[in-house]
Amino acid sequence: DSEEDEEHTIITDTELPPLKLMHSFCAFKADDGPCKAIMKRFFFNIFTRQCEEFIYGGCEGNQNRFESLEECKKMCTRDNANRIIKTTLQQEKPDFCFLEEDPGICRGYITRYFYNNQTKQCERFKYGGCLGNMNNFETLEECKNICEDGPNGFQVDNYGTQLNAVNNSLTPQSTKVPSLFEFHGPSWCLTPADRGLCRANENRFYYNSVIGKCRPFKYSGCGGNENNFTSKQECLRACKKGFIQRISKGGLIKTKRKRKKQRVKIAYEEIFVKNM
């Protein structure tokens, strides 16, 4: 193979710092939907970390869509006021973690997860399929990530920060590698696995942005989202290369990718999405 064909995405073997999404829909791409209306709406852009305007077609689309700039900011951005830490040295959980599990007024027997404030753990419950409340997660992992406490009584890192007990300052949550990464990958790498609506059971891989790894899942054969790869290699190539290691003094670093030499500017900035 020539040098041109080699792939040298810059990824360490150690586990990557997790991206904590208080609500994964804040990471969805703006989706105007299939209809033809022209409606001004707002979405959260994970790359600019800002709420931005887009034109919505009036039907379908996804949950990263808000009537007003204020509503978008409230759901998907963190401002300084939201980063106040409880005096107990425990970072504040979102309010909905303290809601009781609510099956809702319909009866559809859907398995979901909720945070039980008595046991301090995420537990399974049967959701009826409509209404209920926000203490309702499709996966145990998402529930734990958002509502459970991590070791030492700290909450699992919602902002990517925790309180430094010595000087009460906000510091990056410790991870297995230094916080020397920025995410440049496609936004769908941050969306949850979605098996879709059909009945097949195809082996696929999705990028789990919480643990920074590609993981297998069963795809139904239709629908779903773009975080869906036929091989682990393809998944890694598309998503894991998005985390680029920073050089100590910044500057430029050459990366070699198939058929294309590319210069990537390196700078460190965490991306964290917080929903109130």
């Epitope: 009781e100 609510d102 009866r107 399929g129 409509c130 209404l131």
Partner: antibody, heavy 123, light 112 residues
Framework: QVQLQQSGPGLVKPSQTLSLTCAIS??????????WSWIRQSPGRGLEWLGI?????????RYAVSVKSRITINPDTSKNQFSLQLNSVTPEDTAVYYC?????????????WGQGTLVTVSS | DIVMTQSPLSLPVTPGEPASISCRSS???????????LNWYLQKPGQSPQLLIY???NRASGVPDRFSGSGSGTDFTLKISRVEAEDVGVYYC?????????FGQGTKVEIK
Amino acid sequence: QVQLQQSGPGLVKPSQTLSLTCAISGDSVSSDSAAWSWIRQSPGRGLEWLGIIYKRSKWYNRYAVSVKSRITINPDTSKNQFSLQLNSVTPEDTAVYYCARWDSDKMWGFDDWGQGTLVTVSS
Amino acid sequence: DIVMTQSPLSLPVTPGEPASISCRSSQSLVFRDGNTYLNWYLQKPGQSPQLLIYKGSNRASGVPDRFSGSGSGTDFTLKISRVEAEDVGVYYCQQYDSYPLTFGQGTKVEIK
């Protein structure tokens, strides 16, 4: 066939408490395949949902924010009925009040309604 | 709150002719499992409302097949293929995608 029979006063003085009862026949207030709601209708506001109760592993209730601080909906399992209490009423609360059954199983809709009670708030 | 907007507010009809009522929601009422979280009710003069159509397009028991519901996303339609005199009254759409449950302002159907 489920039937809902409403009872309660038609005239309430301002600042007092509006109390209505809905007696259920043909179903149980504790049924896990239904939920029980109060809805009111006035010329100015149209149909306005006020709140709902339902029993699953335990009792749940949800209320409209517009009346949340003043409303209580309670089940009475011994009499197989549920009640509405709305505190500190004003003339704005004048409306026809309906109790309704929400079918949780198949239809996911209000499939049975009480006959309605016109409540006037006036001194 | 999800706002439900109906049109027209008044609909004069001729018996035997078709009629159509539109309901638009301020956000999508279609869940990813395909369920549409929208119902239609008819309130005949002097009566309580009655459920006509549930989950967007299913007729409630006892509802004649001249009534049909359709639509997805934010735009929904109730159609009466051939209006009969007994169909007069006020028609309401209602969403149960999120609390509070909300109704449209109603469409009054009357015979010309």
